[in-house]
Amino acid sequence: HSDGIFTDSYSRYRKQMAVKKYLAAVLGKRYKQRVKNK
């Protein structure tokens, strides 16, 4: 996940937001799976 050559604040911000969104989706899936398995 190198995300290109840009290191300016906007590129860093968009990358950080993408990571947060991705983690939220992954954690959300795991939570739903746990609830489903109970």
Epitope: H1, S2, D3, G4, I5, F6, D8, S9, Y10, S11, Y13, R14, K15, M17, A18, V19, K21, Y22, A25
Partner: antibody, heavy 114, light 111 residues
């Protein structure tokens, strides 16, 4: 040569769907965020949205869920799925690399008409 | 969505002229500097000139420069060359990417 090539454009009826492809060559697309931009004939540029290296997406507020951006890193390709197409969606559609759109494809023309 | 207003919409100039194009945003861009400038020639894809308000993209001649902050930005061509007759667009990046938008464009034509 480092380049992006769009394909999948053509004539579609109002209400129809179309999937555009953007194939990368000369670099690994998996390392970059990718965006889509369109340009209606004789008009200006319009930002559609982008997809991160993680596969998360952001869209312009006017998209309203009609368009979906996805990627297949194994095929070095990004896609734009367009549904419920209208005459006003007639445009040249460009894909571009990273959040600053630093490398562009040549575009593919989508015509929505009955 | 944000509104980006470019002025003028058309600009007539001669080779060697100093040219200035402005881009005004209805709201502040991210970190006050998330703005890019592009050049487009008829039938061609746009080309990135400037990003982060003032950083010159790779391979772009130094006669192009960008300035501004917050809601007001400027693209300057210090000495217009024959290859510079084209349409120029600004693109704003915002805290909420749903607001991202291009300006309406400025056509630089031969006087």
């Amino acid at each position: 040569e480092v380049q992006l090539v769009e394909s999948g454009g053509g004539l579609v009826q109002p209400g129809g769907s179309l999937r555009l492809s953007c194939a990368a060559s000369g670099f690994s697309l998996s390392s970059y965020a990718m965006g889509w931009v369109r340009q209606a004939p004789g008009k200006g540029l319009e930002w559609i949205g982008d997809i991160s290296t993680y596969g998360t997406t952001d869209y312009a507020s006017w998209v309203y869920g009609r368009f979906t951006i996805s990627r297949d890193n194994s095929k070095n390709t990004v896609y734009l799925q367009m549904n419920s197409l209208r005459a006003e969606d007639t445009a040249v559609y460009f894909c571009a690399r990273d959040y600053w759109l630093s490398l562009w494809g040549q575009g593919t023309l989508v015509t929505v008409s009955s | 969505a944000a509104q980006l207003t470019q002025s003028p919409s058309t600009l007539s100039a001669s080779v060697g002229d100093r040219v200035t194009i402005t881009c005004q945003s209805s709201q502040s861009v991210y970190d006050n500097n998330a703005l890019a400038w592009y050049q487009q020639k008829p039938g061609k894809a746009p080309k990135l000139l400037i990003y982060a308000a003032s950083t010159l993209a790779s391979g772009v001649p130094s006669r192009f420069s960008g300035s501004g902050s917050g809601t007001e930005f400027t693209l300057t061509i210090s000495s217009l060359q024959p290859d510079d007759f084209a349409t120029y667009y600004c693109l704003g990046g915002y805290y909420d990417p749903a607001d991202n938008a291009f300006g309406g464009g400025t056509k630089v034509e031969i006087k």
